[in-house]
Interface confidence: medium
């Protein structure tokens, strides 16, 4: 229904403290280099303007539609030009064009440092001195972080990372208490971010349609028992929210994400048997819950999908007459059967079944052609399959880092022209895989491991499209978004690239890495693992594990060293030379 | 649950017409798959005519098409089926059946649908 004032409406149904989050948000995405400061001060702003709304919804401009307002805020900062230079040209737009200007200029890798999170004393003294303030803060570090990470869910992290400061600050040792529990909430936001990021690219790449199609798999996995025109109206709804949420309409992302929860909570009969939990929650609990719930049971007496999709002598005729709907019904009847398949293989299993009755029903004999369409989809199965057995085998032999470093190498050498701190960044999020999946029960194993490789995958894509140095990552990204992961695997050395000349700058390390907490310390050596990949990109594992074991060696033994600096002088050179000989 | 309740059967000559109604409860019938089926003494159960929920698909068996109208009515609820130059050979127990879930498909296997009502008896003789 239409309202007189749109932030009215919003406000009231968001509340206050939603309401103020989700306008941080959306300004620290916006505008990413701005101080929390300098947006704490605009939110108030608009959150006194809605107020005066609310009082009256026919005060002066509360009929203006929201990315007005926020659009009028933006370009009313002085100094914008100075510190956003062409992002100040979306000014001059008028309105839903300057929007988009502005999504165009959200930029996925900002320059801004990695988010340090002070030591825990310091942590507890400010989280109790001013609650808002310092979750504010963390709001506005991760926004402009992460321009499309979702809305309402970072609010639901801001809500447990206020719960775990509110537990731990009264802990004797805060430290121990805090750490583990904000690196878990750090690791699943994180993991949330490139998610999200990868629904936003399939919003914009391809549109609505291929978003609907991903999440009535998704739907239908997790619902089996939900009948297709549930399923049909909760992938209309996800759908409408994940785009207004990609389009910075985060105010109406939230108040929608809501009324869908509640929508679920009380149709749970026609939906599913695991909902209740999760309803007995607050709202963005409840949204949270609702977004990672459980499959529920397969019914028992599903019949072959053969009946319907194959043996049918009308399957022509039902394509012809209403190809989405038809290819909608097949999607959902194979996802409601495999939770243990990934979405972006049923996808590609929904593609396959389309390209055969294009094909098929132009024939003379459409059910002799389309008779063997399932038995077709065999290959596509079993290599996502071997890929999550493969993985899975040389994960659980060589540990996480050996894994991340094993896939650096093969990822170096399939992209070699991609910039270190990118392959490092994609080849340890990729490597985390095995530690978030390997260890799952086997049904789990596959949608786990691929729908999160795609995702790690999407990132990799956004920061190349960026700088594009290499034409086979460019192919990969360019083409459909579920064939994307397979594209990648089946990449080989790039014989094109020729090797980068030895410089010893780059393998030349000093003490300073000694003090490094262990993350950092790895992230060196996988940078000098890469570089040594892009100097001998057909090193054997043999003569890299040989080079390796020798840098660690180096570091370990100058690390301990008395005069750790005089150590790092005399063996460096050593290190180099042996490394050059090595690898000859 | 879907509740199915058919009427309209009789006695007709041959060449004669007939209109069977079906009246579901329970379920939206444009939200589903919906079909008429029937069953002769002594011989399977065939399907007859079928229409698809959400769109108007239509389906008829060989031995109907051009004779035989399936329509349904959205807001009466009611699925029909118009019989027209009538045959002994049509003389059966005429049922209505639905098949919610997979609202497109109208199949022409009886096992495929969960729901049916418990038939009208149509006798075609002079």
């Known amino acids: 229904e239409a309202h007189k004032s749109e932030i009215a409406h919003r406000f009231k149904d968001l509340g206050e403290q939603h309401f103020k989050g989700l306008v941080l948000i959306a300004f620290s995405q916006y505008l990413q280099k701005c101080p929390y400061e300098e947006h704490i001060k605009l939110v108030q702003e608009v959150t006194d303007f809605a107020k005066t709304c609310v009082a009256d919804e026919n005060a002066e401009n509360c009929d203006k539609s929201i990315h007005t307002l926020f659009g009028d805020k933006l370009c009313a900062i002085p100094k914008l030009r100075d510190n956003y230079g062409e992002l100040a040209d979306c000014c001059a737009k008028q309105e839903p064009e300057r929007n988009e200007c502005f999504l165009q200029h959200k930029d996925d890798n900002p320059n801004l440092p990695p988010f340090q999170r002070p030591e825990a004393e310091a942590m507890c003294t400010s989280f109790q001195e001013n609650p808002t303030s310092f979750l504010g803060h963390y709001l506005h570090e991760v926004a402009r972080r992460h321009p499309y990470f979702y809305a309402p869910e970072l609010l639901y992290y801001a809500e447990k990372y206020n719960e775990v400061l509110t537990q731990c600050c009264t802990e004797s040792d805060k430290a121990a208490c805090l750490t583990p529990k904000l690196d878990a909430v750090k690791e699943k936001a994180l993991v949330a971010a490139v998610r999200q990021r990868m629904k936003c690219s399939s919003m914009q790449r391809f549109g609505e349609r291929a978003f609907k199609a991903w999440a009535v798999a998704r739907m239908s996995q997790r619902f089996p028992n939900a009948e297709f025109a549930e399923i049909t109206k909760l992938a209309t709804d996800v759908t409408k929210i994940n785009k207004e949420c990609c389009h910075g309409d985060l105010l109406e992302c939230a108040d929608d994400r809501a009324e869908l929860a509640k929508y679920m909570c009380e149709n749970q009969a026609t939906i599913s048997s695991k909902l209740q939990a999760c309803c007995d929650k607050p709202v963005l609990q409840k949204s949270q819950c609702l977004a990672e719930i459980e499959h529920d049971n397969i019914p028992a007496d599903l019949p072959s999908i053969a009946a319907d999709f194959v043996e049918d002598k009308e399957v022509c005729k039902n394509y012809a007459e209403a190809k989405d709907v038809f290819l909608g019904t097949f999607l959902y009847e194979y996802s409601r059967r495999h939770p243990d398949y990934s979405v972006s293989l049923l996808l590609r299993l929904a593609k396959k079944y389309e390209a055969t009755l294009e094909k098929c029903c132009a024939e003379g004999d459409p059910p002799a052609c389309y008779g063997t369409v399932l038995a077709e989809f065999q290959p596509l199965v079993e290599e996502p399959k071997n890929l999550v057995k493969t993985n899975c085998e040389l994960y659980e032999k060589l540990g996480e880092y050996g894994f991340q470093n094993a896939v650096l190498v093969r990822y170096t050498q399939k992209a070699p022209q991609v910039s270190t701190p990118t392959l490092v960044e994609a080849a340890r999020n990729l490597g985390r895989v095995g530690t978030k999946c390997c260890t799952l029960p086997e049904a789990q194993r596959l949608p786990c491991v691929e729908d999160y490789l795609s995702a790690i995958l999407n990132r990799l894509c956004v920061l190349h499209e960026k700088t594009p140095v290499s034409e086979k990552v460019t192919k990969c990204c360019s083409g459909s978004l579920v064939e994307r992961r397979p594209c990648f695997s089946a990449l080989t050395v790039d014989e094109t690239y020729v090797p980068k000349e030895f410089k010893a700058e780059t393998f030349t390390f000093h003490s300073d890495i000694c003090t490094l907490p262990d993350k950092e310390k790895q992230i060196k050596k996988q940078t000098a693992l890469a570089e040594l990949v892009k100097h001998k990109p057909k090193a054997t594992e043999d003569q890299l594990k040989t080079v390796m074991g020798d840098f660690a060696q180096f570091v370990d033994k100058c690390c301990k060293a008395a005069d750790k600096d005089n150590c790092f002088a005399t063996e460096g050179p050593n290190l180099v030379a042996r490394s050059k000989e090595a690898l000859a | 649950e879907v509740q199915l309740l058919e009427s309209g059967g009789g006695l007709v000559q041959p060449g004669g017409s007939l209109r069977l109604s079906c009246a579901a409860s329970g379920r939206y019938i444009d939200e589903t798959a919906v079909a008429w089926f029937r069953q002769a003494p002594g011989k399977e159960r065939e399907f007859v005519a079928g229409?698809?929920?959400?769109?108007?698909?239509?389906y008829y068996a060989d031995s109907v098409k051009g004779r035989f109208t399936i329509s349904r009515d959205n807001s009466k609820n009611t699925l029909y089926l118009q019989m027209n130059s009538l045959r002994p050979e049509d003389t059966a127990v005429y049922y209505c059946?639905?098949?919610?879930?997979?609202?497109?498909?109208?199949?022409?296997?009886?096992?495929?649908?969960?729901?049916w009502g418990q038939g009208t008896l149509v006798t075609v003789s002079s």
């Open positions: 059946a639905a098949r919610p879930g997979s609202p497109l498909i109208t199949s022409k296997v009886a096992d495929l649908y969960p729901y």
């Open positions: 229409i698809g929920g959400g769109v108007d698909i239509t």
